[in-house]
Amino acid sequence: RKIPKVGHTFFQKPESCPPVPGGSMKLDIGIINENQRVSMSRNIESRSTSPWNYTVTWDPNRYPSEVVQAQCRNLGCINAQGKEDISMNSVPIQQETLVVRRKHQGCSVSFQLEKVLVTVGCTCVTPVIHHVQ
Amino acid sequence: RKIPKVGHTFFQKPESCPPVPGGSMKLDIGIINENQRVSMSRNIESRSTSPWNYTVTWDPNRYPSEVVQAQCRNLGCINAQGKEDISMNSVPIQQETLVVRRKHQGCSVSFQLEKVLVTVGCTCVTPVIHHVQ
């Protein structure tokens, strides 16, 4: 799903207040709900009719450093006989997410939000057929 | 997928540098890759064999203010005849994502990262059958 543009209003102080110095803001240390965890069924990526694999990207100057991307294994979907049915489509499900980028020069460390497109998994879709004239 | 614990090292300065004052850091204004967009097909949530609905939650003190959650429409999956097949399962696909929480007291505005669990869509899964003795 889409993350709207900041419009630079969310991070601004109220109009009656002095502006933020140097184009930066105060980010408190610590993460709210840090212990919250995904509770997805085990092996969902292998048991789905539109199965997928995971690829891990790693960047030590990004939080989270590990970002996992899914790739659909097939063009079609897997039927009850375990065979690929190309009349159906394995389609990626994407999500816009935020990460934090760390930038440092010597002891001066600053952070910036970055938008990342993550493919979270795949779903099986019945396409509408059109015959082109 | 899971976001690891901060371990409070990512946001720390190198050991040889003076510590961050007041437990906060500098967050630069602006978002990297802000114009990046999800390119998911229209109506994927209706054409899927494990269809889902969307619910929008809105919070003006969160960025993004709008967070969209998916809910699977059925327990089973939709077969080629358009009927629900309860021998298969519609299963939510979840993703841990970061949002920014805004906290203000008068003209003092600070921000904090928050972890949010988002259900992005649903996939159709073949259940493992166990007969309990």
Epitope: N89, V91, P92, V125, H131 | S41, I44
Partner: nanobody, 116 residues
Framework: EVQLVESGGGSVQAGDSLRLSCAAS????????FGWFRQTPGKEREFVAG????????EYANSVKGRFTISRDNAKNTVDLQMDSLKPEDTAVYYC?????????WGQGTQVTVSS
Amino acid sequence: EVQLVESGGGSVQAGDSLRLSCAASGRANSINWFGWFRQTPGKEREFVAGIRWSDAYTEYANSVKGRFTISRDNAKNTVDLQMDSLKPEDTAVYYCVLDLSTVRYWGQGTQVTVSS
């Protein structure tokens, strides 16, 4: 509306090569995959080859594996099917298919005839 223009069909001898091309135009954005099916009289259309747009992942029917190669040109919205070591049983009408995940477009087809 989406248009598909197929080209490259014709008549060849067994063992020869042919190259089919398909160009998509119109509202052909958010491509999922692009590929080819074929049909012989009295039989169902069968999948031949497909290529995923995002990462160039390819799939082939067992009957053409090692002989046919599918490739794509993202900039031009085209897909090519290089058919080598053709056999008489490859004789069919070949249909270009453009898949946009929830909608699938079929071309009008181009005849390939392989004689022994």
